[in-house]
């Protein structure tokens, strides 16, 4: 009976449910288009349960299919600003290991100041996700305007 | 053996899977920026399994991490209208209890007539979510254009 | 004890976790606004675990509440192009069986070149989802710009 009891933990402990929601920490230095993220209850409503941060980039700890979602809002932005500084583009991709490098999700701002999207994608343990923002406009660091997260969905 | 059997119900019964998808009922009176929601199979494809509606606002019944998503489309809207009535902003937040009041998700329409986004956030039993639409434009009540939902993801 | 062991498979095998992420294959012939999808590991990062494709349209194999998500980016598009070719609209709906035909999700491009959204909706075994793109602009087939997916959430 004890074995059946222990097995009950599978969904949460062994099977997955890895999840993370991150807030923007800072942008990279010039020539580095990556956004650098941070997470943890001390910072507000961001958290990491399973995945980890590696120098501000999100590293996956469990193989599976994940729902990846992101919202980025440009600070000091109006539709005029956005169109004048076009193209401003956000791309989410696997940036390491190099052998698995691929763009997963890409959006342009055009005349808007916010992009938001989500997708399902297979990710493997060790995959590091990078979010590249190209253009001169900077993202808002407000936690309700800019965030990035993943949710393990199934093996 | 019966105990192991009963335990099998955990994922659905005890562990969570609370979920709700709501459709717009009406906007608030002047000076009340909140959108008022409704849900239930008699209304179409909206539903509440766990969370409840309290005067048109969504109240959470189970602690956990939730995926919150929303789409709002402005009625009688073109990109010209949207920019002329800028700023029109949508914010989703915890509005009660007051001690936990916080904005979770915020988007401006700029030159667009629809906003859509989603995020992961910890919510606690008793948290009431409010969706505030500021500006003079009214939202569409078409069920495929304006909707709001939550999905329990993990404890 | 063996019975309790077998039951552990419920979440993955019996209980659901049907999931699919598709990439654009092609648009329909004139007068057919539907987008035709494809999926499978040989094509990249698209997949079908449970649902199936029927002539490029997604058919559901398990009753339940699903998270449906989509992103469509218009090819050869700028905010000027998008507004000049307005209205360009995307609608996701159940297109068969005819008795259950309904629009689930609808968005216009206005001055933008990408739409992205998601919603929870009940779907039944045999429901076929169609994605209709109306207007003269064509969607990008880049797999990080245009995709469509569903995720089983609960019974």
């Amino acid at each position: 009976q004890r074995f059946a009891q222990a097995q009950q933990q599978l969904p949460l402990e062994s099977l997955g449910w890895d999840v993370a929601e991150l807030q923007l920490n800072h942008t990279g230095p010039q020539q580095d288009p990556r956004l650098y993220w941070q997470g943890g209850p001390a910072l507000g409503r961001s958290f990491l349960h399973g995945p980890e941060l590696d120098k501000g980039q999100l590293r996956i700890h469990r193989d599976g299919i994940y729902m990846v979602h992101i919202q980025v809002t440009l600070a000091i932005c109006s539709s005029t600003t956005a169109s004048r500084h076009h193209p401003t583009t956000l791309a989410v991709g696997i940036c390491s290991p190099a052998s698995r490098s691929i763009s997963l999700l890409r959006l342009s701002f055009h005349q808007g100041c916010t992009i938001a999207s989500q997708r399902l994608t297979p990710l493997a343990r060790g995959d590091t996700l990078c979010t590249n923002l190209t253009g001169t406009l900077l993202p808002s660091r407000n936690t309700d305007e800019t965030f990035f997260g993943v949710q393990w969905v199934r093996p | 053996q019966r105990f192991a059997q009963a335990q099998q119900q955990l994922p659905l019964e005890s562990l969570g899977w609370d979920v709700a998808e709501l459709q717009l009922n009406h906007t608030g009176p002047q000076q009340d920026p909140r959108l008022y929601w409704q849900g239930g199979p008699a209304l179409g494809r909206s539903f509440l399994h766990g969370p409840e509606l309290d005067k048109g606002q969504l109240r959470i019944h189970r602690d956990g991490i939730y995926m919150v998503h929303i789409q709002v489309t402005l009625a009688i809207c073109s990109s010209t209208t949207a920019s002329r009535h800028h700023p029109t902003t949508l914010a989703v937040g915890i509005c009660s209890p007051a001690s936990r009041s916080i904005s979770l998700l915020r988007l401006s329409f700029h030159q667009g007539c629809t906003i859509a986004s989603q995020r992961l956030t910890p919510l606690a039993r008793g948290d009431t979510l409010c969706t505030n639409l500021t500006g003079t434009l009214l939202p569409s009540r078409n069920t495929d254009e304006t909707f709001f939902g939550v999905q329990w993801v993990r404890p | 004890q063996r019975f309790a062991q077998a039951q552990q498979q419920l979440p993955l095998e019996s209980l659901g976790w049907d999931v699919a992420e598709l990439q654009l294959n092609h648009t329909g012939p004139q007068q057919d606004p539907r987008l035709y999808w494809q999926g499978g590991p040989a094509l990249g990062r698209s997949f079908l675990h449970g649902p199936e494709l029927d002539k490029g349209q997604l058919r559901i194999h398990r009753d339940g509440i699903y998270m449906v998500h989509i992103q469509v980016t218009l090819a050869i598009c700028s905010s000027t192009t998008a507004s000049r070719h307005h209205p360009t609209t995307l609608a996701v709906g159940i297109c068969s069986p005819a008795s259950r035909s309904i629009s689930l999700l609808r968005l216009s491009f206005h001055q933008g070149c990408t739409i992205a959204s998601q919603r929870l909706t009940p779907l039944a075994r045999g429901d076929t989802l169609c994605t209709n793109l109306t207007g003269t602009l064509l969607p990008s087939r880049n797999t990080d710009e245009t995709f469509f997916g569903v995720q089983w959430v609960r019974p």
Partner: antibody, heavy 122, light 107 residues
Framework: QVQLQESGPGLVKPSETLSLTCTVS??????????WSWIRQPPGKGLEWLGY???????NYNPSLKSRVTISVDTSKNQFSLKLRSVTTADTAVYYC??????????????WGQGTLVTVSS | EIVLTQSPATLSLSPGERATLSCRAS??????LAWYQQKPGQAPRLLIF???NRATGIPARFSGSGSGTDFTLTISSLEPEDFAVYYC?????????FGGGTKVEIK
């Protein structure tokens, strides 16, 4: 077009409280995108940020003045105000109100009032 | 707090010449740096935000560059109305701070 206008006494005695009001037109202090701020400039010197108030009522002050400064907002009048307690002659300056655009970590100022000179003298 | 040091304190140039103003931060401010112009008896006016983005209505002769700790404001060809004091300001973190200013005067 957003316009800001400072008002208040031009002369304040040492140890008293300096009180200024900024009236906003062409925009709303209730907007959830802007940080309504006060900045001062002593005669012939540089600019010093004093603090801001956000639509929600949250405030942020310069630590060098934190114990003496209070910023408040009156959304019904579309105004925000500055109070600086226990003033000395070192507080003599032109005081500007301004609209801050950016995020909760920091803003820059895209619209300014014309400024009002406040002299601290007995 | 982050200290911003502007140099030179005064720049004497003739109309039509190129002006190069420098702002150095005591620690990295990423690209969160703005430039303002102030004329006597007037409020400052925002020229550049976030290192390189021209504010609405600012002529193309004004440009900003830099990242981290070193920033530059360039006026490609000075017009008579450009003679004024210029301030940099960081919004990387609180408290917001301004540089001491550079006066651009007619030679």
């Amino acid at each position: 077009q957003v316009q800001l206008q400072e008002s208040g006494p031009g002369l304040v005695k040492p140890s008293e409280t300096l009180s200024l009001t900024c009236t906003v037109s062409g925009g709303s202090v209730s907007s959830d995108y802007y940080y309504w701020s006060w900045i001062r400039q002593p005669p012939g010197k540089g600019l010093e940020w004093l603090g801001y108030i956000y639509y929600s009522g949250s405030t942020n002050y310069n630590p060098s003045l934190k114990s003496r400064v209070t910023i408040s907002v009156d959304t019904s009048k579309n105004q925000f105000s500055l109070k600086l307690r226990s003033v000395t002659t070192a507080d003599t300056a032109v005081y500007y109100c301004a609209r801050g655009d950016g995020d909760f970590m920091g803003v820059c100022f895209d619209y300014w009032g014309q400024g009002t000179l406040v002299t601290v003298s007995s | 707090e982050i200290v911003l040091t502007q140099s030179p304190a005064t720049l004497s140039l003739s109309p039509g010449e190129r002006a190069t103003l420098s702002c150095r931060a005591s620690q990295s401010v990423s690209s969160y740096l703005a430039w303002y112009q102030q004329k006597p008896g007037q409020a400052p006016r925002l020229l550049i935000f976030d290192a390189s983005n021209r504010a609405t209505g600012i002529p193309a002769r004004f440009s900003g560059s830099g990242s981290g700790t070193d920033f530059t404001l360039t006026i490609s060809s000075l017009e008579p109305e450009d003679f004024a004091v210029y301030y940099c300001q960081q919004r990387s973190n609180w408290p917001l701070t301004f540089g001491g200013g550079t006066k651009v005067e007619i030679k």
